[in-house]
Interface confidence: low
């Protein structure tokens, strides 16, 4: 390579303002906004500025930020003004850094994912370890299987169900059943040397606003693991849900807007209106997470060009969970929740 490698990082510190302790005014009233909002890079949030005036592209990690040019709330960024003492006028967008975790004597950094063994995938989040079971709640095959057996498979970590009356089941039904069965949660079932597998949906990539959730499934013609994705929106970013909590109550588990609206995605609009339910907030340090949900298909029509459809998380109910410290860690201790099947699906 042209420049000999030595990994290193250099961060940008904002140039100090002229030597004065007066803070500049970044907000102007009445609001003065350009006629058309800026076009943001793909994947960057278009948000209302800190002055509550104009639409701006959210500042990202390492960008300058002010009370007007605010950091991307969807990416867990905050404005670090420490490099601009004593005015604290221009900062740099920084990641909220949490504390690490210790498990079985091993220290993990905040955000680090690891597998303590072959059965669990864990993530350290703000001092707490949340784990996703990799051998998820195996259940015996249903309907056609009268003699299920739970067996260990050589070279594989997770136990599997096999059906001793395989020879007697109708071929077509078996295939359909296996597929419906696999799609209902993270389960494994042998079918002609193919173990059908569908993982649970990953947590939504954002705690508010539009995010992405993914899962791995080999329920396809090739029995090949493929990543499926769906859009998710746990709660709107621009609504202060706490204002909707009734007096004397500690939470509003489900928030639902009064009117049905269209979903919008990259300038394209859903062909019909929806009145989605969102997860609310819990004001007593519990976190509000989806409890019953499903995936729906939403058709979008674009102003120019063809339309398209996308899978979207549809929330039926949410609840305030005591053990979940990270608002997005919806798979911690999953199996102890009621209606696990509906959460996984």
């Amino acid at each position: 390579t042209a420049l000999s490698p030595t990994p290193t990082t250099m961060t940008f510190t904002p140039a100090p303002l002229e030597e004065t302790t007066t803070r500049p005014e970044f907000c102007k009233w009445p609001c003065e906004c350009p006629q058309s909002p800026p076009r943001c890079p793909l994947g960057v949030s278009l948000i209302t500025d800190g002055c509550e005036c104009c639409k701006i592209c959210a500042q990202q990690l390492g960008d300058n930020c002010t009370e007007a040019a605010i950091c991307d709330p969807h990416r867990g960024l905050y404005c670090d003004y420490s490099g601009d003492r004593p005015r604290y006028a221009i900062g740099v967008c920084a990641q909220v850094v949490g504390v690490g975790c210790v498990l079985d004597g091993v220290r993990y950094t905040n955000g680090e994912s690891f597998q303590p063994n072959c059965r669990y995938n864990c993530t350290c989040i703000d001092g707490t370890v949340g784990c996703t079971p990799l051998c998820l709640s195996p259940r015996p095959p249903r309907l056609w299987c009268r003699q299920p057996r739970h067996v260990r498979v050589p070279g594989q970590c997770c136990e599997q169900w096999v059906c001793d009356d395989d020879a007697r089941r109708p071929r077509q039904t078996a295939l359909l059943d296996t597929r419906a069965f696999a799609a209902s949660g993270a389960v494994e079932q042998r079918y002609e040397n193919c173990i059908a597998y569908t993982s649970p949906w990953s947590p939504c990539s954002t705690t508010c606003g539009l995010g992405i959730s993914t899962r791995i499934s080999n329920v396809n013609a090739r029995c090949w693991p493929e990543q499926e994705s769906r859009l998710c929106n746990l709660r709107p970013c621009d609504v202060d849900i706490q204002l909707h909590i009734k007096a004397g109550k500690k939470c509003l588990a489900v928030y639902q807007p009064e009117e049905a609206t269209n979903f919008t995605l990259a300038g394209c609009v859903s062909t019909r209106t929806y009145r989605p339910k969102y997860c609310g907030v819990c004001t007593d340090n519990r976190c509000c997470i989806p409890y019953k949900s499903k995936t729906i298909s939403v058709d979008f029509q674009c102003p120019e060009g063809p339309g398209f459809s996308r899978q979207v998380l549809w929330i039926n109910a949410c609840f305030c969970n005591l053990s979940c410290r990270n608002p997005n860690d919806i798979f911690a201790d999953l199996e102890s929740y009621p209606d696990f099947e509906e959460i996984a699906n």
């Epitope: 961060t11 943001c40 890079p41 994947g43 592209c57 996308r310």
Partner: antibody, heavy 119, light 110 residues
Framework: QMQLVQSGAEVKEPGSSVKVSCKAS??????LNWVRQAPGQGLEWMGG????????NYAQKFEGRVTITADESTNTAYMEISSLRFEDTAMYYC??????????????WGQGTLVTVSS | QAVLTQPPSVSKGLRQTATLTCTGD????????AAWLQQHPGLPPKVLSY???SRPSGISERLFVSRSGNSASLTITGLQPEDEADYYC???????????FGGGTQLTVL
């Protein structure tokens, strides 16, 4: 290791169209962009797409004549230019944006696809 | 016509220091910062720095990037023959809604 693999070189006649592909390994939620470089010239952004969303974003200059599409299942982006002109002769690069779309640059690049427009 | 302005060429001696500049406006470099790319003949560009002035792992510590207002600069110390290449700055322009590039600077190591 993240890789972008582009389709092979093309020789086309003026007025025809060409479709170049770019297959990305890994996550399909990163924007894939198309950048061209005419012989001896600088880099010029044409547009981009996030395969998982499927909605493209074009540079004004190329709007209408260039179509960018993606196949989410194979994590492949396509760039088609219609009504080819001699001045479209260039190396066409596919480039992926990195984490934190607003500050990471186009951090992974394909090997390039040479499109020659000749009569 | 490139949106960002770079000097067409810079020549420096072996083991000397070269500083390349890139000037834009408040909707690109001034707003988002600039990234730097290096391109050797016949090869695709390679990222040297991110727009927050940090470097990807594996990029030499002989390289320094900085930004002041609407301008960014790339400094390479202790120049080596392999540093001879074209260098481009790039930024996202929020008013154009597009990635923009400089015209490129050809660095010659004498």
């Amino acid at each position: 290791q993240m890789q972008l693999v582009q389709s092979g070189a093309e020789v086309k006649e003026p007025g025809s169209s060409v479709k170049v592909s770019c297959k990305a390994s890994g996550d399909n939620s990163y924007p894939l962009n198309w950048v061209r470089q005419a012989p001896g010239q600088g880099l010029e952004w044409m547009g981009g797409i996030i395969p998982i969303f499927g909605t493209p974003n074009y540079a004004q200059k190329f709007e209408g004549r260039v179509t960018i599409t993606a196949d989410e299942s194979t994590n492949t982006a396509y760039m088609e230019i219609s009504s080819l002109r001699f001045e479209d002769t260039a190396m066409y690069y596919c480039a992926r944006e990195g984490d934190g779309y607003n500050y990471s640059p186009l951090d992974y690049w394909g090997q390039g696809t040479l499109v020659t427009v000749s009569s | 016509q490139a949106v960002l302005t770079q000097p067409p060429s810079v020549s420096k001696g072996l083991r000397q220091t070269a500083t390349l500049t890139c000037t834009g406006d408040s909707s690109n470099v001034g707003n988002q910062g600039a990234a730097w790319l290096q391109q050797h003949p016949g090869l695709p560009p390679k990222v040297l720095s991110y727009r927050n002035n940090s470097r990807p792992s594996g990029i030499s510590e002989r390289l320094f990037v900085s930004r002041s207002g609407n301008s960014a600069s790339l400094t390479i110390t202790g120049l080596q023959p392999e540093d001879e290449a074209d260098y481009y700055c790039s930024a996202w322009d929020s008013s154009l809604g597009a990635w923009v590039f400089g015209g490129g600077t050809q660095l010659t190591v004498l």
